[in-house]
C-alpha cells in the first residue's frame, strides 16, 4: 500500500536533482581554478542535509550553514550585479563583462539556478511529486530559504557602487516583493556601499520614455536613500546594443546613448 504523501501546490523536485547538483558542482570547479579544492561530494551532502528528512515548511537559514561554509568563495565586493525579473540579460552581461558577478556566477547560485527541491519529514526521500509554493503553502520552504540566505549574504558582501538590472517592460519595474526588493535592498550595508545604480532595461524598440521617473523607481530611490545609500539610475534603451558595446566598447556607435 503506497504511503500517504503530502500534496503541495508547487512543482516537485527537479528530476535527477542529485545528479544535476553534483554535475554542476564538478563543472563549476573545473571552470573556476580557484574553486578546484572544493569536494563536490561534500557539497552535495551538505546541500542534501539542509532539507532531507525535514518538514519542507520548517526550513531555516541555519539548515544551510554547512553548505554556505563549503561554498565560500571570493567575489570582488565592488563588482556585484544584482537583478530583478531580468535574469537572462544579467547573465549574458556578466558572461561578457567577466569581472562582474551575479549571484548565479557564484558556486552556490550556479548549483541551484532554476532548480526546485524538497524532502519529507522523517523520511530520507526526495519529493519529486510536489513542493511547497511560497504563496499557497509556506514561505519557509527549502528553495525560498536557500535563495533568501544566499541573496542576503551576497548583498551584505557588496561594497562601493552596486549595480542592479531591472526589467523596464514589467508593470512594476521595481517590485518590493521580489528577492531584490524584499531581501537584497535591505541587506546592503550603508558603511560599505556608497551608491546603488539601477539599470532600467527597455523592452520596446521605440520606447524612449525615461523609465527612471517611473513611480516604482522613485519608491526604490526612497528606500535606498532612507538606508543612507546614494541612488542613481540609467535607462538602457537598447539592450542588444548595450551588450554589443560591452563586447566591443571601441565601436564608433557606442559613444551615443544606449
Amino acid at each position: 500500500v503506497p504511503r500517504w504523501r503530502q500534496q503541495w501546490s508547487g512543482p516537485g523536485t527537479t528530476k535527477r536533482f542529485p545528479e544535476t547538483v553534483l554535475a554542476r558542482c564538478v563543472k563549476y570547479t573545473e571552470i573556476h581554478p580557484e574553486m578546484r579544492h572544493v569536494d563536490c561530494q561534500s557539497v552535495w551532502d551538505a546541500f542534501k542535509g539542509a532539507f532531507i528528512s525535514k518538514h519542507p515548511c520548517n526550513i531555516t537559514e541555519e539548515d544551510y550553514q554547512p553548505l554556505m561554509k563549503l561554498g565560500t568563495q571570493t567575489v570582488p565586493c565592488n563588482k556585484i550585479l544584482l537583478w530583478s525579473r531580468i535574469k537572462d540579460l544579467a547573465h549574458q552581461f556578466t558572461q561578457v563583462q567577466r569581472d562582474m558577478f551575479t549571484l548565479e556566477d557564484t558556486l552556490l547560485g550556479y548549483l541551484a539556478d532554476d532548480l526546485t527541491w524538497c524532502g519529507e519529514f522523517n523520511t530520507s526521500k526526495i519529493n519529486y511529486q510536489s513542493c511547497p509554493d511560497w504563496r499557497k503553502d509556506c514561505s519557509n520552504n527549502p528553495v525560498s530559504v536557500f535563495w533568501k540566505t544566499v541573496s542576503r549574504r551576497f548583498a551584505e558582501a557588496a561594497c562601493d557602487v552596486v549595480h542592479v538590472m531591472l526589467n523596464g517592460s514589467r508593470s512594476k519595474i521595481f517590485d518590493k516583493n521580489s528577492t531584490f526588493g524584499s531581501v537584497e535592498v535591505h541587506n546592503l550595508q550603508p558603511e560599505k556601499v556608497q551608491t546603488l545604480e539601477a539599470w532600467v532595461i527597455h523592452g520596446g524598440r521605440e520606447d524612449s520614455r525615461d523609465l527612471c521617473q517611473d513611480p516604482t523607481i522613485k519608491e526604490l530611490e526612497s528606500i535606498i536613500s532612507k538606508r543612507n545609500i546614494q541612488f542613481s539610475c540609467k535607462n538602457i534603451y537598447r539592450p542588444d546594443k548595450f551588450l554589443q558595446c560591452v563586447k566591443n566598447p571601441e565601436d564608433s556607435s557606442c559613444t551615443s546613448e544606449i
Epitope: 565560500t72 570582488p76 565586493c77 561594497c159 550603508p190 558603511e191 560599505k192 532612507k226 543612507n228 546614494q230
Partner: antibody
C-alpha cells in the same frame, strides 16, 4: 573639499549635560551616515555608533545606550552628540567621522570634573 | 562583538627598517573573500588617518611604504622603510559587523 568641523572643548561637572556639534561641508550631508568615536585620554578608539543622516535614525553600540544621543540639524549640515548625566569616565575626545572613516572631525575634548 | 587584538602594544624600529603590526580578529571579518578591515595612523592631538581599507587597499594619497595583508581573521600592517614621520599609534578596525570595533592600538617609536 570635504570637511568636518567640530565644536570647541567643554569643561563640565558630573551630572551635567553636554552637546557637541559636527558641521559637514563639501558634500551632500544626507548622502552619508555619520559615525561617532570616543577616545579617553591615553586610550584607544571606541566606536559609539552612527546616525543615518537621511532619516535621523541613530544606532548605538551597547556601551553607549542610555545617556548618549545622536541628532541632526539637516538644514545646517550638522550632526550632534549629547551626553547627559555626565560621569568622570566620560572625559574623552569625541570624534565624528563620515561613512567610510576617511573624513574625521578634529575632535572635541570633553572634561568632566567636580 | 568581534574583538580585535593588536600586537605588539608598542615597538621600536630603526629608520629605514621594516615595521610589522599584527591584528587578529576573534571571528572572520570577511564575506565572499572581502575582508572589511581598515588600518589607521593617529598622531597626538590629531584624528585618525585612514591608511588601508579592505585589508590590503592603499587609501589615496598614502605612501606605498604602507601595505596591508591578510584575510579572514589575521592581518598585518607593514611599513617599509620606516621614516621619522611614521611615529604614531596604529589601529585596525573592522566594519564587517556592527558594532564596528577597533584594535587596542600599537605605538610605533624610532630606535
Amino acid at each position: 573639499q570635504i570637511q568636518l568641523v567640530q565644536s570647541g572643548p567643554e569643561l563640565k561637572k558630573p551630572g551635567e549635560t553636554v552637546k557637541i556639534s559636527c558641521k559637514a561641508s563639501g558634500y551632500t550631508f544626507t548622502n552619508s551616515g555619520m559615525n561617532w568615536v570616543k577616545q579617553a585620554p591615553g586610550k584607544g578608539l571606541k566606536w559609539m555608533g552612527w546616525i543615518n543622516t537621511y532619516t535621523g535614525e541613530p544606532t548605538y553600540a551597547d556601551d553607549f545606550k542610555g545617556r548618549f544621543a545622536f541628532s541632526l540639524e539637516t538644514s545646517a549640515s550638522s550632526a550632534y552628540l549629547q551626553i547627559s548625566n555626565l560621569k568622570n569616565e566620560d572625559t574623552a575626545t569625541y570624534f565624528c567621522a563620515r561613512r567610510g572613516f576617511v573624513y574625521w572631525g578634529q575632535g572635541t575634548l570633553v572634561t568632566v570634573s567636580a | 562583538d568581534i574583538v580585535l587584538t593588536q600586537s605588539p602594544a608598542s615597538l621600536a624600529v630603526s629608520l629605514g627598517q621594516r615595521a610589522t603590526i599584527s591584528c587578529r580578529a576573534s571571528e572572520s571579518v570577511a564575506i565572499y573573500g572581502n575582508s572589511f578591515l581598515k588600518w589607521f595612523q593617529q598622531k597626538p592631538g590629531q584624528p585618525p588617518k585612514l591608511l588601508i581599507y579592505r585589508a590590503s587597499n592603499l587609501e589615496s594619497g598614502i605612501p606605498a611604504r604602507f601595505s596591508g595583508s591578510g584575510s579572514g581573521t589575521d592581518f598585518t600592517l607593514t611599513i617599509n622603510p620606516v621614516e621619522a614621520d611614521d611615529v604614531a599609534t596604529y589601529y585596525c578596525q573592522q566594519i564587517n559587523e556592527d558594532p564596528y570595533t577597533f584594535g587596542g592600538g600599537t605605538k610605533l617609536e624610532i630606535k
